[in-house]
Interface confidence: low
Amino acid sequence: APVPPGEDSKDVAAPHRQPLTSSERIDKQIRYILDGISALRKETCNKSNMCESSKEALAENNLNLPKMAEKDGCFQSGFNEETCLVKIITGLLEFEVYLEYLQNRFESSEEQARAVQMSTKVLIQFLQKKAKNLDAITTPDPTTNASLLTKLQAQNQWLQDMTTHLILRSFKEFLQSSLRALRQM
């Protein structure tokens, strides 16, 4: 399957060559999404002062963004591969509605927003192939997601800026935790 080169842009290996291993692909994919999030955060921070706001000030929000907890089995202590993989997939599925919300929130980084969304869909699909216990994975209700999206889009400008910042920050943290956990699998 087609595979990208290494991190060095001067890599001369053919773009279509032998595939990466399953775990290497996932690792690279998450890092690719994290790069996209960094670009989006840059635009958000340039546009508003949300990035300067303290974590505490931003903690008071009614967004139900996925977060890793001890019980999810993704941390070093109490690590549980199956439980953790289910949590990662479930969390990514829950983030999808928020990534959809981000699609109209960027001007110069519109492409990055779409790249993050599309690459996350692909990551989910790939992780689902890896998961054995697919029954334990709950898919978010489309009706609930649609109404959440409407509510988010109806917020005033300041709240929309804050929501965008929170989504990006939470998604980054979730992916970083996922990356660490997946490297143990």
Epitope: A13, P15, A39, E111
Partner: antibody, heavy 122, light 111 residues
Framework: QVQLVQSGAEVKKPGSSVKVSCKAS????????IEWVRQAPGQGLEWMGV????????NYAQKFQGRVTITADESTSTAYMELSSLRSEDTAVYYC???????????????WGQGTTVTVSS | DIVMTQSPDSLAVSLGERATINCRAS??????????MNWYQQKPGQPPKLLIY???NRGSGVPDRFSGSGSGTDFTLTISSLQAEDVAVYYC?????????FGQGTKLEIK
């Protein structure tokens, strides 16, 4: 808005060369490839080759090896495809298309240029 | 090279009816369980447009009446309810290995 804008139509003599350009705009991520595909009149699509944005990595279809040269100039965001030793059967519309350079994206050609008609005739 | 064979070569379907196009690869285009299969729509005088990537994922702005399925060597593109604007030639393409190869195309018309 992502755009791939190609150079204009060309009429060439058999044995000569043609160089088609493809200027990319509207995106900044480096994780893309420019692929070249051609389509003879009334025929299907035929992949010719691929280049990275900076022209560092190039891969050609065996059929065109030795006759096609794909290059790219990162400073102007322009890719080029040169086909030499032209013959009448090279008469076709030549397209550049962008695919994502991402380990789990599927090399689907998500954006296309408008096409450049190359006519080879004596 | 992987050879892609589409069937039928042409297809006439009534407006509002379902249209199905098949594509068979000479060898599996799956890798790590992912099908490296894409579908394109091409209207006269226009470049192709990406409809489906990775067998079943719709491209940006593609209406949900278009869907794709399959894995391994056998794939299907389905248009659930044909609209007048769907008249075009449809191509499958594998991106599992170089050279990327396309099917010969299926011409879809209104009955």
């Amino acid at each position: 808005q992502v755009q791939l804008v190609q150079s204009g139509a060309e009429v060439k003599k058999p044995g000569s060369s043609v160089k088609v350009s493809c200027k990319a705009s509207g995106y900044v991520l480096p994780n893309y490839l420019i692929e070249w595909v051609r389509q003879a009149p009334g025929q299907g699509l035929e992949w010719m080759g691929v280049t990275t944005p900076g022209g560092g990595t190039i891969n050609y279809a065996q059929k065109f090896q030795g006759r096609v040269t794909i290059t790219a100039d990162e400073s102007t965001s322009t890719a080029y495809m040169e086909l030499s030793s032209l013959r009448s059967e090279d008469t076709a519309v030549y397209y550049c298309a962008r695919s994502r350079w991402d380990p789990l994206y599927y090399y689907a050609l998500e954006y296309w240029g408008q096409g450049t008609t190359v006519t080879v005739s004596s | 090279d992987i050879v892609m064979t589409q069937s039928p070569d042409s297809l006439a379907v009534s407006l509002g009816e379902r249209a199905t196009i098949n594509c068979r690869a000479s060898e599996s285009v799956d890798n790590y369980g992912i099908p490296f299969m894409n579908w394109y729509q091409q209207k006269p005088g226009q470049p192709p447009k990406l409809l489906i990537y990775a067998a079943s994922n719709r491209g940006s702005g593609v209406p949900d009446r278009f869907s794709g399925s399959g894995s391994g060597t056998d794939f299907t593109l389905t248009i659930s309810s044909l609209q007048a604007e769907d008249v075009a030639v449809y191509y499958c393409q594998q991106s599992e290995e170089v050279p990327l190869t396309f099917g010969q195309g299926t011409k879809l018309e209104i009955k």
